[in-house]
Interface confidence: low
């Protein structure tokens, strides 16, 4: 299917305002410290080009590549060299290796200032004003910290942002109706960023074999009733969907996304009977309906496996003849019966499977090998769920915020030399487990909690590559990809670290504690509580405990004194000296 | 979908004034925003007006305080009262609509300004 001009193709098919705003997104995902106005004046240039492609497709310039003229685009501003340094390099490289440049300069940590969220009546001014730009302003700022997030999604979620301030700028209490509404899609754009960085990792560190396996297990848990092929389609059409928004080929992504969704609405009875309500919507929405669609009924009179992967007189004349097909059936196979399992649970099962295998097909009598294959399942199916059950006892008995401090300190003394702005971020969004997945019922926990740790732990291992402190930390994010976690769990008390000094600069505190919000007082004491555990790795539970409670304390009695900075300068060292103490 | 059929146009003197109406069906539920487009003989289609479910508008500098968009929800039909008609205001007028962006389209209607 080629075209005369990629450039023109893409613009009529996507239509102009969803062509400008892929654009924006994919330049302010590599350019991610240039300014707004810089990136506005860039997505003209390329649109106003792309309508002379559409008005003339071999005007001059129009067959050029996507990437070609993107990245010339990319490579006129001035002041690339100053704000990017060797990234400038990039510029001196051919296509396609310009692009992977590009790529491998992508930040996900970027030093960006926090997002400060101003009074309701200056967004509802500045929404009012001009509307275009404020839409723009979003997906610019949210582009430039989220360096890989799935851009169709990043529309959709402008969409419900627009909609919001359309909705509350006009209400009586325009901050009761707005705020709500956009916390819910600051912690939803967190969530579907952290979920799509995992699905980049997949497939740019373990290949498209990793993220197809992934797709097999969850299209089968989704879509029971659809037939192996069918769902073979789905997961080929998937990961080239993805593979191209991991690739920053936005434009292709979106377009072929919006294709998927077609085939999947045009072709609902062959793949599950849950996606009626989704195909009445229109194209963005019904993407991210089909994306989140609940799994389909289980059909009724599924057959047991065995007759078919054990007692089969024929496993390794199949397995032979098509490896991976004939282990992409069992994949299939065992999701679509087991809803209750994580994706990363099945797809151990899978790599044992293949194992078992590999190891019984060349022995003298390949029947009588792996004829005991499903009980080798046992342990590694009961980790997840002993796993589960406890954590969430702890959670139902500590509540939130003491559960996260729990994990804190778990990990700082797994990996102690991880920054401790990472063991804070990543045991916070550990913690949150917890809330997301304890309270769902049995069938539905070890997926939820599993695979939420997966996409947690994902966080800690791309911003552990960017600067490698520990060597566990690499053993457990690069061996792997389904064993990630249960690495992470298997980790003990790093008996090598050599314990951090003690700084009393990090504990001392002052006044302004008192007038950060409820998060942000338990941010300080996390990180307070990280580097209790790096000067002390072998603190017990009690001694930490004890430390913490006479923090809180001390805190509560400054934040209620007269002269609350007097306060702090007095008890602050008294506190320092009792915890050293206390932990001596 | 959602369908749009615009009606209201034709020939008009210099100054004068027309209003143009769009009625919308389908799936309306999804709506956000609706919008007038206008495109003239060999020119490229430009924005005109924009108003959002809760009647917010924006108009480009060329038309702003000569023209008024409005919608009617409960008619499902969408409004442009257009006062002190130029010559250069001659195009075919687009009526749009859409949950973000509009990505539905009418037929267009045709508004001749001339002497």
């Known amino acids: 299917d080629t075209h005369k001009s990629e450039v023109a193709h893409r613009f009529k098919d996507l239509g102009e305002e969803h062509f400008k705003g892929l654009v924006l997104v994919a330049f302010s995902q590599y350019l991610q410290q240039c300014p707004f106005e810089e990136h506005v004046k860039l997505v003209n240039e390329v649109t106003e080009f792309a309508k002379t492609c559409v008005a003339d497709e071999s005007a001059e310039n129009c067959d050029k590549s996507l990437h070609t003229l993107f990245g010339d685009k990319l490579c006129t501003v001035a002041t690339l060299r100053e704000t990017y340094g060797e990234m400038a390099d990039c510029c001196a490289k051919q296509e396609p290796e310009r692009n992977e440049c590009f790529l491998q300069h992508k930040d996900d940590n970027p030093n960006l200032p926090p997002l400060v969220r101003p009074e309701v009546d200056v967004m509802c001014t500045a929404f009012h004003d001009n509307e275009a730009t404020f839409l723009k302003k979003y997906l610019y700022e949210v582009a430039r910290r989220h360096p890989y997030f799935y851009a169709p999604e990043l529309l959709f979620f402008a969409a419900r942002y627009k909609a919001a301030f359309a909705e509350c700028c006009q209400a009586a209490d325009k901050a009761a109706c707005l705020l709500p509404k956009l916390d819910e899609l600051r912690d939803e754009g967190k969530a579907s960023s952290a979920k799509q960085r995992l699905k980049c990792a997949s497939l740019q560190k373990f290949g498209d074999r990793a993220f197809k396996a992934w797709a097999v297990a969850r299209l089968s848990q989704k879509f029971p009733k659809a037939e192996f092929a069918e769902v073979s389609k789905l997961v080929t059409d998937l990961t080239k969907v993805h593979t191209e928004c991991c690739h920053g080929d936005l434009l292709e992504c979106a377009d072929d996304r919006a294709d998927l969704a077609k085939y999947m609405c045009e072709n609902q009875d062959s793949i599950s009977s849950k996606l009626k309500e989704c195909c009445d919507k229109p194209l963005l929405e019904k993407s991210h309906c089909l994306a989140e669609v609940e799994n389909d009924e289980m059909p009724a009179d599924l057959p047991s496996l065995a007759a078919d992967y054990v007692e089969s007189k024929d496993v390794c004349k199949n397995y032979a003849e098509a490896k991976d097909v004939f282990l992409g059936m069992f994949l299939y196979e065992y999701a679509r019966r087991h809803p209750d399992y994580s994706v990363m649970l099945l797809l151990r099962l899978a790599k044992a499977y293949e194992a078992t295998l590999e190891k019984c097909c060349a022995a003298a009598d390949p029947h009588e090998c792996y004829a005991k294959v499903f009980d080798e399942f046992q342990p590694l199916v009961e980790e997840p769920q002993n796993l589960v059950k406890q954590n969430c006892e702890l959670f139902e008995q500590l509540g939130e915020y003491k559960f996260q401090n729990a994990l804190l300190v778990r990990y700082t003394k797994k990996v102690p030399q991880v920054s401790t702005p990472t063991l804070v971020e990543v045991s916070r969004n550990l913690g949150k487990v917890g809330a997301k997945c304890c309270k769902l019922p049995e069938a539905k926990r070890m997926p939820c909690a599993e695979d939420y740790l997966s996409v947690v732990l994902n966080r800690l291992c791309v911003l552990h590559e960017k600067t490698p402190v520990s060597e566990k930390v690499t053993k457990c994010c690069t061996e792997s990809l389904v064993n990630r976690r249960p690495c992470f769990s298997a980790l003990e008390l790093d008996e090598a670290y050599v314990p951090k000094a003690f700084n009393a600069e990090t504990f001392t505190f002052h006044a302004d504690m008192c007038t950060l919000s409820e998060k942000e007082k338990q941010v300080k004491k996390q990180t307070a509580l990280v580097e209790l555990v790096k000067h002390k790795p072998k603190a017990t539970k009690e001694q930490l405990k004890g430390v913490m409670d006479n923090f809180a304390a001390f805190v509560e009695k400054c934040c209620k004194a007269d002269d609350k900075e007097a306060c702090f300068a007095e008890e602050g060292p008294k506190f320092v000296a009792a915890s050293q103490a206390a932990l001596a | 979908q959602v369908q749009l059929v615009e009606s209201g146009g034709g020939l008009v003197q210099p100054g004068g004034s027309l209003r143009l109406s769009c009625a919308a069906s389908?799936?309306?539920?999804?709506?956000?925003?609706m919008a007038w487009y206008r495109q003239a003989p060999g020119k490229q289609r430009e924005f005109v007006a924009r108003?959002?479910?809760?009647?917010?508008?924006n108009y480009p500098d060329s038309v702003k305080g000569r023209f008024t968009i409005s919608r009617d929800n409960s008619k499902n039909t969408l409004y442009l009262q257009m006062n002190s008609l130029r010559a250069e205001d001659t195009a075919v007028y687009y009526c749009?609509?859409?949950?973000?962006?509009?990505?539905?389209w009418g037929q267009g209607t045709l508004v001749t300004v001339s002497s």
């Open positions: 108003i959002s479910k809760g009647g917010s508008t």
């Open positions: 749009a609509a859409g949950p973000v962006w509009e990505q539905f």
């Open positions: 389908g799936s309306i539920e999804s709506i956000n925003r």
